[in-house]
């Protein structure tokens, strides 16, 4: 059984699926295009109920080259046939078609964090969305990496419940006057690259009094 | 019709590496998943993992990771499931199959290739 | 994992007779999508495997309609209301819901 999606040439464009923010982003890169597009349509149909593709409302004559797809795609067994018209005024410049299974190809984009350091602790705060819908959780679990003078220590908090809402992570029994940089990310059991956030970093207190911090490990 | 055309026996020395083959036809390459099955002797069926074609994504069984390495070849139609460092437990017939609309549904499966691990 | 459970191991079935497979999982295949990703394959002896029936109930084409699944979330069946030469095998259930995707021990289908 399979959908023969028509004769478009997928070589000449490159996409890819990613979770941003726990929505669907896909987003495309041109190869080798002499005339770049003005804008761009973004079509789809499913392999199991092959109709005639679909316009997403969203993505019909856009100049961005990314499309939420959030609210279009939510199975992550299904085949998305999708198609990607590109335009130069009334002229179509290229087609490029591409299968994805969320599963398989979706790739997970670090959280939103920001991290507020005291004279021997850090508080690492995520921002997820308030409401992730049940088929975006996709088994992830969050890493907040902790770096100081060449030593890396990954912290694996327990989330309980969904990834929803904002979270608050405290790192330890830090050395006070002392350069620390972290980075989060979601881990997936899968052979996709991690996509780890860019360090945050900061220079802690000296210590003055002792202070302790509870864990929230 | 669709077909999956797998490669031939192997017998490989233990420590080795071995590439089995499967060659799609009668339907576009790219537009279906290919999976992987083992089955030892005598036993039943264990997934090994998944891989899109068209974009080379992958998702293996944990108990796989490091063993199987799953590829495809667009322009030859053709997956590739290489298994390293093999030992005797590697022994076993492996199954390419091909996903029908959905994923995890295998709707065409190849004759399988056996493989012996024996010093 | 997902721990895929059939019953009975060995079937031993007269021509023209019915017969009934079970498959139990360990936790709901019912996806989110609503879908229920449990399928049947038979493999006869010395051949590869060929699917029978996708999502718990549909039959693949070619298939007799004599085959019939049926089932939901954790308790399936394969039926087969007369059993034919060609049908004798091992037939196993797998489940595509929850990675990775898991197989019943299989169920041989014999003569008596």
């Known amino acids: 059984i399979s959908y023969d999606s028509p004769d478009y040439t997928d070589e000449s464009c490159t996409f890819k699926i990613s979770l941003r923010n726990f929505r669907s982003i896909l987003s495309w890169e041109l190869k080798n295009h002499s005339i770049v597009p003005t804008h761009y349509t973004l079509l789809y149909t499913i392999m199991s109920k092959p109709e005639d593709l679909k316009v997403v409302k969203n993505c019909a004559n856009t100049t961005r080259s990314f499309c939420d797809l959030t609210d279009e795609w939510r199975s992550t067994h299904e085949a998305y046939v999708t198609v990607l018209e590109g335009f130069s005024g009334n002229t179509t410049l290229f087609s490029c078609s591409h299968n994805f299974w969320l599963a398989i190809d979706m790739s997970f984009e670090p959280p939103e964090f920001e991290i507020v350091g005291f004279t021997n602790h850090i508080n690492v705060m995520v921002k997820f969305p308030s409401i992730v819908e049940e088929e975006l959780q996709f088994d992830l679990s969050l890493v907040i990496e902790e770096q100081s003078e060449g030593i890396v220590k990954k912290h694996k908090p327990e989330i309980k419940g969904n990834m929803s809402g904002n979270f608050t992570y405290i790192i330890d029994k830090l050395i006070p006057n002392t350069n620390y940089c972290v980075s989060v990310y979601l881990e997936h059991s899968d052979e996709q690259a991690v996509i780890k956030s860019p360090l945050k970093c900061t220079l802690l207190p000296p210590g003055q009094e002792s202070e302790s911090a509870e864990s929230a490990k | 019709q669709v077909q999956l055309q797998q490669s031939g026996a192997e017998l490989v020395r233990p420590g080795t590496s071995v590439k089995v083959s499967c060659k799609a036809s009668?339907?576009?390459?790219?537009?279906?998943?290919i999976e992987w099955v083992q089955q030892r002797p005598g036993q039943g069926l264990e997934w090994i993992g998944v891989?899109?074609?068209?974009?080379?994504?992958?998702k293996y069984n944990e108990k796989f990771k490091g063993k199987a390495t799953l590829t495809a070849d667009k322009s030859s139609s053709t997956a590739y499931m290489q298994l390293s460092s093999l030992t005797s437990d590697d022994s076993a017939v492996y199954f390419c199959?091909?996903?029908?609309?959905?994923?995890?549904?295998?709707?065409?499966w190849g004759q399988g290739t056996s493989v012996t691990v024996s010093s | 994992d997902v721990v895929m459970t059939q019953t009975p191991l060995t079937l031993s079935v007269t021509i023209g007779q019915p017969a009934s497979i079970s498959c139990k999982s360990s936790?709901?295949?019912?996806?989110?999508?609503?879908?229920?990703?449990l399928n049947w394959l038979l493999q006869r002896p010395g051949q590869s495997p060929k699917r029978l029936i996708y999502?718990?109930?549909k039959l693949d084409s070619g298939v007799p309609d004599r085959f019939t699944g049926s089932g939901s979330g954790t308790d399936f069946t394969l039926k087969i209301s007369r059993v034919e030469a060609e049908d004798l095998g091992i037939y196993y259930c797998?489940?595509?819901?929850?990675?990775?995707?898991?197989f019943g021990g299989g169920t041989k289908l014999e003569l008596k």
């Open positions: 936790q709901s295949l019912l996806d989110s999508d609503g879908k229920t990703y």
């Open positions: 999502l718990v109930s």
């Open positions: 797998w489940q595509g819901t929850h990675f990775p995707w898991t």
């Open positions: 009668g339907y576009a390459f790219i537009n279906n998943l």
């Open positions: 199959a091909r996903d029908g609309y959905y994923l995890g549904t295998m709707d065409h």
């Open positions: 891989i899109n074609p068209g974009s080379g994504n992958v």
